[in-house]
């Protein structure tokens, strides 16, 4: 059974001090969202016993295996059903605690009733505050039965449930008809799936004979031991104040387990801790009684004394539950109550015995669950005991169950049953996950879901280049940590597989499925430097750079230019996709902006070192375009341009620039400055005769402005070829009479 305990603190003077704690003794319990198990859950279950809504309860996690619920503000918050869920996968288990109000009209004589299939269960509700009205019994929140208030027997209302079956299990309540449901008596009925002393799918298997009030689990035949007892058959008492399947937990506080209710996985239910009894578990056992709820009687013989926590304490020379066995009868010594082996291993099991006459090798035998008897292969004889060693054939899953070591001499016989758990080594169900990659290393998460049994003791990561026949490289890692595979080849695919191991010999599982992980390209190492740059307009910048000369091929796919506009907090990135490029034109920039510029080489997704930065100031944008540009041929070599000044000027114009281009020509245009900004007319001279020209112009203040519309005009016919256009300006008012 899962090692899960729900503790309720029943010191109820103040509900704000009330708390519930769920403790798991499972390996890796409650760690949370990783692959090694879901978290512990502790909550109030309002599906059956509904209470008025109140402030939310506070959940506090104490480490990985404990969770506590607090924040109860009034007594009614406590009434009802609480549950703790723990364990992983098929072992996920719910432990239930039912809380009754101490001031209720009806109180349960006993809250938890565990009965066998076919038994008669009797629930008894004791009258605490009488009402002369019907008593309604409910099962799992639905009407079940009615009793007349006259039907009380000795101040108790009884509900008899004959021939109970597992579906009868659940929460029962007894309520006076006119009372609040919070004044009900709440019960928990647990019906085992088998008759008394039997377990298994067809109830064909025999229970081990649980001692000290332990209850045989109907699914796996294990004893669910009361708090304070341990061992396969609950034969061993824990030290006072301890609980858990291995007595590993300790009751909080100075008064030990006083005032605590312990709830364990079904079919046990809830009880006080060992040595305590009463509705609030605050009363010590009466003399002669011991155990959980003080339900057990000592009946010690041969001078044994009764301890309320552990039972009979025997004098020297006697042993047994009631000190009824003489030490002269042979006795199995120090046999572990539970052993764990891995599937297909061939373990050695030792069994030691003492007695008078002294046990010899042939008098000790080992019996498997299927009835097979193994004889010891060797025995070690010491003055006080004989230890027989048994070599077990290769284990199969069917070997899980109760084994028995038996010693027989003429002085009598003794046997000790112990549980053997055959565990299946874990096998990953999925491939490991790549977290990050570099050119020579891969960071891998080995945490994957697995079949078989935990806990995981080690994780091995096997890897080798894809399609390689070389040996696998192996790295052993901690189960909870990510792994870095080092010293790999760049731009190479690696096949990576996980192998999980659990504790013990033969705990290594098969390798999991492979996955392909590829290392990144090598990082580019060369640092470019900026040769120069020049502004080609208010929004255009030409940049050139160089790389140091190194032997061998260039490691790089291209360049990344970065422009940082600190004022606006914006970065512009320009990708130059040729590693041979050494210049680039950046367009669409913001005029009048101060940029920081750098360049770096890239390879795949990796960036090399950036060049030292340069600081570039783009000129602000120029004025609007001149208006109403007009061209008029004056001769075979002259054309006059007229225009109007731009509107809404941001400042005084410093000059105009005229662009002259032969229509349909392939050559570069010619730019001519008009240095007298007050002019609105100019004559372009030195043109070719009978030639069609295109003209446009723009103004300049601090920077060049927008171009005007383009105008066409042809020179007049048949002059000589001129040397090239020149310009003469006049104010428009002076006329053009020369």
């Amino acid at each position: 059974a899962v090692d899960l305990t729900l503790l309720a603190n029943l010191r109820l003077t103040d509900p704000q001090r009330f708390f519930l704690t769920c403790v798991s003794g499972e390996a890796g319990a409650g760690r949370g969202s990783d692959a090694w198990g879901p978290p512990l859950l502790l909550e109030k279950d309002d599906r059956i016993v509904r209470t008025p809504p109140g402030p939310p309860l506070r959940l506090a996690r104490n480490g990985s295996h404990q969770v506590t619920l607090r924040g109860f503000s009034k007594p009614s918050d406590l009434v009802g059903v609480f549950s703790c869920v723990g364990g992983a996968g098929a072992r996920r288990t719910r432990v239930i605690y039912v809380h009754n109000s101490p001031g209720a009209h009806l109180l349960p004589d006993k809250v938890t009733h565990t009965v066998n299939k076919g038994d008669t269960a009797v629930l008894s509700a004791r009258v605490h505050k009488e009402k002369q009205t019907d008593v309604i019994w409910k099962s799992n929140g639905s009407y079940f039965y009615t009793l007349d208030w006259h039907e009380a027997q000795d101040g108790r209302f009884l509900l008899q449930l004959p021939n109970v079956q597992p579906p009868s299990s659940g929460i029962y309540s007894a309520t006076y008809l006119e009372a609040s449901p919070l004044g009900s008596a709440f019960f928990r009925l647990i019906v085992r799936g088998c008759g008394a002393g039997r377990w298994g799918p067809g109830c064909t298997k025999e229970c081990p004979g649980c001692l000290h009030g332990g209850v045989c689990h109907d699914h796996d035949g294990e004893c669910v031991c009361p708090p304070g007892f341990t061992g396969t058959r609950c034969e061993q008492a824990c030290r006072e104040g301890r609980f858990g399947q291995s007595c590993q937990e300790q009751c909080p506080g100075i008064s030990g387990c006083r005032g605590l209710t312990f709830c364990l996985p079904d079919p046990y239910g809830c009880s006080c801790g060992s040595g305590w009894r009463g509705s609030q578990c605050q009363e010590a056992c009466a003399p002669g009684h011991f155990g959980a709820d003080c339900r057990l009687q000592c009946q010690c013989q041969n001078g044994g004394t009764c301890d309320r926590f552990s039972g009979c304490v025997c004098p020297s020379g006697w042993h047994g539950v009631h000190c009824e066995k003489s030490d002269r009868i042979p006795q199995i010594l120090n046999m572990a109550s539970e052993l764990e082996f891995n599937l297909e291993t061939m373990p050695r099991i030792n069994c030691a015995a003492a007695g008078n006459p002294f046990p010899v090798r042939g008098s000790i035998e080992l019996r498997k669950p299927d009835g097979t008897v193994l004889l010891s292969t060797k025995a070690i004889v010491e003055p006080e005991k004989t230890t027989a060693e048994f070599e077990v054939p290769r284990l199969v899953l069917a070997d899980s169950g109760f084994w028995e070591c038996r010693v027989s001499t003429s002085g009598g016989q003794d046997s000790r049953r112990f549980k053997v758990n055959v565990k299946v080594p874990p096998v990953p169900l999925a491939a490991p996950r790549l977290l990050t990659k570099q050119s020579r290393q891969l960071v891998v998460s080995p945490l994957v879901s697995f079949s078989g049994d935990g806990p995981i003791s080690t994780v091995r990561l096997h890897y080798r280049p894809q399609d390689s026949t070389m040996d696998w490289s192996t790295i052993v890692v901690d189960p909870s940590e990510n792994v870095t595979l080092m010293n790999l080849r760049p731009k190479t695919g690696y096949s990576v597989r996980v192998q999980l191991s659990r504790p013990g010999e033969g705990g290594e599982g098969a390798w999991g499925p492979p996955t392909l992980m590829t290392t990144d390209c090598p990082e580019p190492l060369l640092q470019p430097w900026l040769e120069g740059w020049h502004v080609e307009g208010t929004d255009r910048l030409r940049v050139s750079w160089s790389l140091p000369l190194v032997p061998g091929p260039l490691v790089g796919d291209g360049f990344l230019l970065r422009l940082w506009d600190g004022t606006r907090g914006q970065e512009r990135r320009e990708n130059v996709s040729s590693p041979q490029a050494r210049t680039a034109l950046l367009t669409g920039l913001t005029p009048g902006t101060h940029y920081q510029l750098d360049v770096q080489l890239y390879h795949c997704t990796l960036l090399g070192p950036a060049s030292p930065p340069a600081h570039v100031l783009l000129p602000p944008s120029g004025p609007p375009a001149p208006r109403h540009l007009h061209a008029q041929a004056l001769s075979d070599s002259e054309i006059q341009l007229t225009w109007k000044h731009p509107e809404a000027l941001p400042g005084p114009i410093s000059k105009y620039v005229v662009e002259v281009q032969v229509a349909g020509g392939a050559g570069d245009p010619l730019w001519i400055d008009v240095d007298r900004p007050e002019e609105t007319s100019t004559i372009i001279r030195g043109l070719n005769a009978s030639t069609r020209y295109l003209f446009r112009m723009r103004a300049s203040i601090q920077g060049l402005g927008d171009w005007s519309n383009t105008v066409e005009e042809s020179t007049l016919g048949n002059g000589l070829q001129a040397e090239g256009p020149v310009q003469e300006s006049r104010a428009a008012e002076e006329g053009l009479d020369q």
Epitope: Y143, T146, L147, D148, E151, E178
Partner: antibody, heavy 127, light 102 residues
Framework: EVQLLESGGGLVQPGGSLRLSCAAS????????MGWVRQAPGKGLEWVSW????????TYADSVKGRFTISRDNSKNTLYLQMNSLRAEDTAVYYC????????????????????WGQGTLVTVSS | DIQMTQSPGTLSLSPGERATLSCRAS???????LAWYQQKPGQAPRLLIY???SRATGIPDRFSGSGSGTDFTLTISRLEPEDFAVYYC?????????FGQG
């Protein structure tokens, strides 16, 4: 499906006796409180008697106390009403009904209700 | 005994209209112990409302109950043709259980 089927009604002279039966099916009869309600021709409903699931507790209307006896046989899923010293004013359709209990809000007290009724059997007391 | 008095004795309405039926107890009744039943000619009564305001299984939501203490009301928000019937209130608070006159 829950069903209640009354039988045993008929014509009887004043002072005579009659035994009504109610056969129940479709639910766990032995868990429920059961009762008889009657309705005189053209009149309203009048509660007559009820009996607890165990048969241990019974209650009667003043008008029938001492003359009528309610009983049940849980093994046969049957409710009975033994009517003695019948009078003309006992003439009515007799219905058997199941008492159920509802958890109306989940937080407040339980609310009862007669949730299933038989089709009724007519008892006529006349000379 | 607690007397249950219903009013009006007869309510004449048409389909689609709203019906309001009143039930008054001679002494205070816990709202948990007040039920309403519907009876059509030649049929057994049918439980409509329990606990003064909770609808029984299968009862349409046009039926609603309210009230506390001595005054209780059954409301049919929009009458359907099949709603024309005799309605009874009943108290369970003290023995004997008593019905209104309908």
């Amino acid at each position: 499906e829950v069903q209640l089927l009354e039988s045993g009604g008929g014509l009887v002279q004043p002072g005579g006796s009659l035994r009504l039966s109610c056969a129940a099916s479709g639910f766990t009869f032995s868990s429920y409180k059961m009762g008889w309600v009657r309705q005189a021709p053209g009149k309203g409903l009048e509660w007559v008697s009820w009996i607890y699931p165990s048969g241990g507790g019974t209650t009667y209307a003043d008008s029938v106390k001492g003359r009528f006896t309610i009983s049940r046989d849980n093994s046969k899923n049957t409710l009975y009403l033994q009517m003695n010293s019948l009078r003309a004013e006992d003439t009515a359709v007799y219905y058997c009904a199941r008492v159920n209990y509802y958890d109306s809000s989940g937080y407040g007290p339980i609310a009862p209700g007669l949730d299933y009724w038989g089709q009724g059997t007519l008892v006529t007391v006349s000379s | 005994d607690i007397q249950m008095t219903q009013s009006p004795g007869t309510l004449s309405l048409s389909p689609g209209e709203r019906a309001t039926l009143s039930c008054r107890a001679s002494q205070s009744v816990s709202s948990s112990y007040l039920a309403w039943y519907q009876q059509k000619p030649g049929q057994a009564p049918r439980l409509l409302i329990y606990g003064a305001s909770s609808r029984a299984t299968g009862i349409p939501d046009r039926f609603s109950g309210s009230g506390s203490g001595t005054d209780f009301t059954l409301t049919i928000s929009r009458l359907e043709p099949e709603d024309f019937a005799v309605y009874y209130c009943q108290q369970y608070g003290s023995s004997p259980w008593t019905f209104g006159q309908g």
